[in-house]
Interface confidence: medium
């Protein structure tokens, strides 16, 4: 397998939890607009999941632009962990568990899970890829843990893996420990495989940043994101070399990498938008 010849590093990159956005504009890329002023503003970066500074030109642009860091945080970040822990301790379900399953208005159907308040269990459904509501989970485990009754929620058995929500492929779940690696390649290498909105079944490869390998997926023929390569070699060249291994005392060992000009595309499959 040429993939193994390419590099023998085992990637143990940590995986961020599903991105849950309060407003869809939080997913827009920073847009300085056509004017030439130099104004310090803040935007929400979906890749780092933080509010960051950028220079705004003074006109046009988009709604992902805030006067202050606080305003940005207020509009685009939510403390999911605290909210979920609190509700678990109180043995209450978050309100969104009682919402009906909502595919949203898009047509990029992917498998997701929702809590069905009628049957009192998590069930599978097809999510269109945008809008919808927060009763929408990437994995069955996450849905069970947050919304189902039971003393300890759902316990996965001794494999520590999860179902990938994009294409139902089974991929190892990353351990939630400090990462030994940093990714410095193109940002789209960290996005999930995205079938897109059409109905074709083209053989493509995407970089799975959790396991550090290029994996096949079926591309629909349109839409999707840039984590989409016609060959495994192309995928490896673009993404595999982007990891920098950390060693103790903060030192870095660099691996060779090729960088493409970054064009940020948003993988809407990973974005949960609250209905407004």
């Amino acid at each position: 397998d040429s993939e193994e010849d390419e590099e023998h590093t085992i990637i143990t990159d940590t995986e961020l939890p599903p991105l849950k956005l309060m407003h869809s504009f939080c997913a827009f890329k920073a847009d300085d607009g056509p004017c030439k002023a130099i104004m310090k503003r803040f935007f929400f970066n979906i890749f780092t999941r933080q509010c960051e500074e950028f220079i705004y030109g003074g006109c046009e642009g988009n709604q992902n632009r805030f006067e202050s860091l606080e305003e940005c945080k207020k509009m685009c970040t939510r403390d999911n962990a605290n909210r979920i822990i609190k509700t678990t301790l109180q043995q209450e379900k978050p309100d969104f568990c009682f919402l009906e399953e909502d595919p949203g208005i898009c047509r990029g159907y992917i498998t997701r899970y929702f809590y069905n308040n009628q049957t009192k269990q998590c069930e599978r459904f097809k999510y269109g890829g945008c809008l919808g509501n927060m009763n929408n989970f990437e994995t069955l485990e996450e849905c069970k843990n947050i919304c189902e009754d039971g003393p300890n929620g759902f316990q996965v058995d001794n494999y520590g893996t999860q179902l990938n929500a994009v294409n139902n492929s089974l991929t190892p779940q990353s351990t939630k420990v400090p990462s030994l690696f940093e990714f410095h390649g193109p940002s789209w290498c960290l996005t999930p495989a995205d079938r897109g909105l059409c109905r074709a079944n083209e053989n493509r490869f995407y970089y799975n940043s959790v396991i550090g390998k290029c994996r096949p997926f079926k591309y629909s023929g349109c839409g999707g994101n840039e984590n989409n390569f016609t060959s495994k070699q192309e995928c490896l060249r673009a993404c595999k070399k982007g990891f920098i291994q950390r060693i103790s005392k903060g030192g870095l060992i660099k691996t060779k990498r090729k960088r493409k000009k970054q064009r940020v595309k948003i993988a809407y499959e990973e974005i949960f938008v609250k209905n407004m």
Epitope: E123, F125, L140, Y159, N201
Partner: antibody, heavy 119, light 107 residues
Framework: EVQLVESGGGLVQPGGSLRLSCAAS????????LDWVRQAPGKGLEWVGD????????LYNQKFKGRFTISRDNAKNSLYLQMNSLRAEDTAVYYC????????????WGQGTLVTVSS | DIVMTQSHKFMSTSVGDRVSITCKAS??????VAWYQQKPGQSPRLLIY???TRHTGVPDRFTGCGSGTDYTLTISSVQAEDLALYYC?????????FGGGTKLEMK
């Protein structure tokens, strides 16, 4: 060649238990979810539930939850259906089927095993 | 649960005929519909998934279409080996549910 072979069917009394097995071969067992579907004599198909072979996460048709349990043994490439408190209306051919995520459909089916619940 | 209704339990046809089998969902299933063929004494065989995509090895005389709640499986020129039971199934949400089946038989 993908093959799914069910076994364990037979005659059982009402209230009794039975464990069905499905041996999978011809593909990587942990790459696909597996489903159980049943078909009563002369009737249509009814989905029972499915399992993610890697982590054992299961989804059930609410109708069977509590009485039926789906499990698997990755070392043996095998899927199981434990059926308890059986009733006459559980009489059916039970099929195991591979659930292919790219299709969101069951692309390979076993030949089925007949379960008869009768006194 | 989503109810899938195949209004015709039986359909009579002749070799070479064009036949359409219909299926209606009790709610919008967003094209998440599969069609299966089952011959007597055999297990079901996947024909179509996502309403219109033919499974590998399925002859091109079988086509599927539909959206929302209404779906159709069409056999453009029926062959003798096509005489079987046909089931639609929604894979939009669990529990996955099947139609009652339509038996294609010779006139």
């Amino acid at each position: 060649e993908v093959q799914l072979v069910e076994s364990g069917g037979g005659l059982v009394q009402p209230g009794g238990s039975l464990r069905l097995s499905c041996a999978a071969s011809g593909y990587t067992f942990t790459d696909y979810n597996l489903d159980w579907v049943r078909q009563a004599p002369g009737k249509g198909l009814e989905w029972v539930g499915d399992i993610n072979p890697i982590n054992g996460a299961t989804l059930y048709n609410q109708k069977f939850k509590g009485r039926f349990t789906i499990s698997r043994d990755n070392a043996k490439n095998s899927l199981y259906l434990q059926m308890n408190s059986l009733r006459a209306e559980d009489t059916a051919v039970y099929y195991c089927a591979r659930y292919y995520g790219d299709y969101d459909a069951m692309d390979y089916w076993g030949q089925g095993t007949l379960v008869t619940v009768s006194s | 649960d989503i109810v899938m209704t195949q209004s015709h339990k039986f359909m009579s046809t002749s070799v070479g005929d064009r036949v359409s089998i219909t299926c209606k969902a009790s709610q919008d299933v967003h094209t998440a519909v599969a069609w299966y063929q089952q011959k007597p004494g055999q297990s079901p065989r996947l024909l179509i998934y996502w309403a219109s995509t033919r499974h590998t090895g399925v002859p091109d005389r079988f086509t599927g279409c539909g959206s929302g709640t209404d779906y159709t499986l069409t056999i453009s020129s029926v062959q003798a080996e096509d005489l079987a039971l046909y089931y639609c199934q929604q894979h939009y949400t669990t529990p996955y549910t099947f139609g009652g089946g339509t038996k294609l038989e010779m006139k």
